[in-house]
Amino acid sequence: EEELQVIQPDKSVSVAAGESAILHCTVTSLIPVGPIQWFRGAGPARELIYNQKEGHFPRVTTVSESTKRENMDFSISISNITPADAGTYYCVKFRKGSPDTEFKSGAGTELSVRAKPSAPVVSGPAARATPQHTVSFTCESHGFSPRDITLKWFKNGNELSDFQTNVDPVGESVSYSIHSTAKVVLTREDVHSQVICEVAHVTLQGDPLRGTANLSETIRVPPTLEVTQQPVRAENQVNVTCQVRKFYPQRLQLTWLENGNVSRTETASTVTENKDGTYNWMSWLLVNVSAHRDDVKLTCQVEHDGQPAVSKSHDLKVSAHPKEQGSNTAAENTGSNERGSSDYKDDDDKHHHHHH
């Protein structure tokens, strides 16, 4: 009779996380009598996975009926595989004794676990930034195996190139994590923009996972201000409007000052939205010129999204007050943009709400 051999036909087996792994093992002889044990790893620190003779192994089932006569198949199935189950598994024949002693081991089967990466999580800067500034976005995904993975960044469908990616740990591990940081230059048109992190992995069968961040959470577009004087609405009254254009987000408070004294404060509510996602708002102030002996300096002061206030002033020259309605007053527009912002034609308003 030839001496028993332990045959593990598969050098390696790859299984998706959550599935069952079948590890094949056959022996070539019924001699010697004794149980089969399965171990993960070799040497004194090896981990017992299954012992035919005794023990409770809830995740392990034998593939064939080991009690049946002439059974030489000691393959096992391990259920609900996780990345922690990766390793080399050895089928070992023991010889009956007191205690049973190890007789012969199979060559081992390496179990690798294919684990899907978690959904990528994209996070942007803690504070908003203004156009022309460069901001960093991070993307993280965890728990994948094997280590090979591809990560790409996109802004509105256009692939980005300025990013750095790390996969940890560097050495062997049951599962891995990826961390990437991309730099994005903001533009005034980015309110509706998206930054996308795309992760491709063998477990995803060509259908990458995506994480997104809306630049609306990151960008702040400061308003431009324009103060204009309207024709006289009634005798001795001048209508002065403050156009607040192209701002984002909507949080905005406007204060009118007459000669440096607060006249009225209001919060932007009924705004108009531009196609690019920014907002416009207009406020007006009725000034009774007859109540003023001297020239009046009107200031529209805007505090946008908690930032330092910006303002624009308009000088009303008080001189003779003509009685006839509808005639030009002596008030003169000498406004200056104290913020230094350039005004530009706002031709993409969807609609206008005049508010006062």
Epitope: L30, V33, N51, E54, T67, R69, E70, N71, K96
Partner: antibody, heavy 119, light 110 residues
Framework: QVQLVQSGAEVKKPGASVKVSCKAS????????INWVRQAPGQGLEWIAM????????HYNQIFKDRATLTTDTSTSTAYMELRSLRSDDTAVYYC????????????WGRGTLVTVSS | DIVLTQSPDSLAVSLGERATINCRAS??????????LFWYQQKPGQPPKLLIY???NRDSGVPDRFSGSGSGTDFTLTISSLQAEDVAVYYC????????FGQGTKLEIK
């Protein structure tokens, strides 16, 4: 280590039934066959039957097929052999034995249960 | 059923001498490359103990003075040098089909 602990001696009248128990320890009960063998005083060994506790598959010696019933309780790792319609020539020591190699052999034995059938 | 017949029924051998017990089957107990024959030793007041499995393989802890041989229908248990503790009844058993035992051979010291 493997141990098979059998129930105590029984005295029965002819026509009665007896149920002998065999509690296993030191191994996974459902992974190995249990055999039952008897030995009349001064006589040889006589195989009665065997049972696979994993699925209750049984094989009986034709001589005992109509009178013997093997059962197991996997929750307590206990095997039972019931013999009905007892006769005086059923007086014997009844052994349970575990088949460690699935060779239909008897590797580990209990100490035996003496069943005496007498009127 | 396969019937096993042992010979002799009893045997007396001097200490240190060879003892040989035979077991003949009514038909071959060979199958699948194995001879499905086993030998047991039973001492007074004790359960039997497995000595040899599949005709020629010593069970764990069995002294190497015990050996089994044979194939098909004819088998032999040999004790190469009898020791006092070997006094017992020896049984053969087959499992080619459902198990049966031989009638036993009583071994004594001459």
């Amino acid at each position: 280590q493997v141990q098979l602990v059998q129930s105590g001696a029984e005295v029965k009248k002819p026509g009665a039934s007896v149920k002998v128990s065999c509690k296993a320890s030191g191994y996974t009960f459902t992974n190995y066959w249990i055999n039952w063998v008897r030995q009349a005083p001064g006589q040889g060994l006589e195989w009665i039957a065997m049972i696979d506790p994993s699925d209750s598959e049984t094989h009986y010696n034709q001589i005992f097929k109509d009178r013997a019933t093997l059962t197991t309780d996997t929750s307590t790792s206990t095997a039972y052999m019931e013999l009905r319609s007892l006769r005086s020539d059923d007086t014997a020591v009844y052994y349970c034995a575990m088949d460690y190699g699935s060779l239909y052999a008897m590797d580990y034995w209990g100490r035996g249960t003496l069943v005496t059938v007498s009127s | 059923d396969i019937v096993l017949t042992q010979s002799p029924d009893s045997l007396a051998v001097s200490l240190g001498e060879r003892a040989t017990i035979n077991c003949r089957a009514s038909k071959s107990v060979g199958s699948s490359g194995y001879n499905w024959l086993f030998w047991y030793q039973q001492k007074p007041g004790q359960p039997p103990k497995l000595l040899i499995y599949l005709a020629s393989n010593r069970d764990s802890g069995v002294p190497d003075r015990f050996s089994g041989s044979g194939s098909g229908t004819d088998f032999t248990l040999t004790i190469s040098s009898l020791q006092a503790e070997d006094v017992a009844v020896y049984y053969c058993q087959h499992s080619r089909e459902l198990p049966t035992f031989g009638q036993g051979t009583k071994l004594e010291i001459k």
